[in-house]
């Protein structure tokens, strides 16, 4: 089939960075420069993406592929291909639709993006607060209350704090 | 495969209007609600609008208060942004995108599918 197909259609050979040009004959010429054709056979080369303003350039575009853009510093990539650069809040903070606000009491964030989460509950897993939350912090778990009343015998080592963010939602 | 794909965006004149519609597939589309968001050149995400999943609730940012209506048309799994008395600010990609539940309000992001973005220019 693909002999058929190359016999039948000369833009077949022409490999990717180049295209098939109706205006010359059907020969295979190179991609104009700000352009590219990831794959053989094409007819058109595709314009490469620009990273403009909030967007900068991760990958020079080439004539077989297109540009790669990331966002500047106080931004992150959102949607396929980086195609979206949201705000980076404050640890301690969330993004709302309308900005960046601080974490409710009883919540944490740790980073620069996402939502704030509950404070991990000790009592579910039978420990008491070692450390208290912060609006950038989980509580850190200690042992049980009855592990630390006088007089307790300590058999078993208490069990390692949970880690942050690991908190049940 | 959930998709939505924005089209409508173009050229137009400050004072102009445009309507952008966002056609979706791959989903139950009255189950959950919708919204638009906007990148300005140069700048980060910018919430701009959203609607709850029977149409019912819209809400929307102060600068488009009055001058955008979101509707969306449940029967043709579309949403639409209709922008009136444009300005230079209003230029920007917009993107629409899923929310997780069928309700939303103007506080969280709940957004877990976006678009690929259609244009809009404002200028004279």
């Known amino acids: 089939f693909e002999r058929t197909r190359s016999l039948q259609d000369p833009c077949s050979n022409c490999p990717a960075g180049t295209f098939c040009d109706n205006n010359r004959n059907q020969i295979c010429s190179p991609c104009p420069p700000n352009s590219f054709s990831s794959a053989g056979g094409q007819r058109t080369c595709d314009i490469c993406r620009q990273c403009k303003g909030v967007f900068r350039t991760r990958k020079e575009c080439s004539s077989t592929s297109n540009a790669e853009c990331d966002c500047t510093p106080g931004f992150h990539c959102l949607g396929a291909g980086c195609s979206m650069c949201e705000q980076d809040c404050k640890q301690g903070q969330e993004l709302t639709k309308k900005g960046c606000k601080d974490c409710c009491f009883g919540t944490f964030n740790d980073q620069k993006r996402g939502i704030c989460r509950p404070w991990t509950n000790c009592s579910l897993d039978g420990k008491s607060v070692l450390v208290n939350g912060t609006k950038e912090r989980d509580v850190v778990c200690g042992p049980s209350p009855a592990d630390l009343s006088p007089g307790a015998s300590s058999v078993t080592p208490p069990a390692p704090a949970r880690e942050p963010g690991h908190s049940p939602q | 495969e959930v998709q939505l794909l924005e089209s409508g965006g173009g050229l137009v004149q400050p004072g102009g209007s445009l309507r952008l519609s966002c056609a979706a597939s791959g989903f139950i589309f009255s189950n959950f609600a919708m919204t638009w968001v906007r990148q300005p050149p140069e700048k980060g995400l910018k919430w701009v609008s959203s609607i709850n999943g029977s149409g019912f609730n819209t809400y929307y940012t102060d600068s488009v208060k009055g001058r955008f209506t979101i509707s969306r048309d449940n029967s043709r799994n579309t949403l639409y942004l209709q922008m009136n008395r444009l300005t230079a600010e209003d230029t920007a990609v917009y993107f629409c995108?899923?929310?997780?539940?069928?309700?939303?309000?103007?506080?969280?992001?709940?957004?877990?599918?976006w678009g690929q973005g259609t244009t809009v220019t404002v200028s004279s």
């Open positions: 995108a899923k929310e997780g539940s069928s309700e939303t309000d103007d506080h969280y992001y709940n957004v877990d599918v």
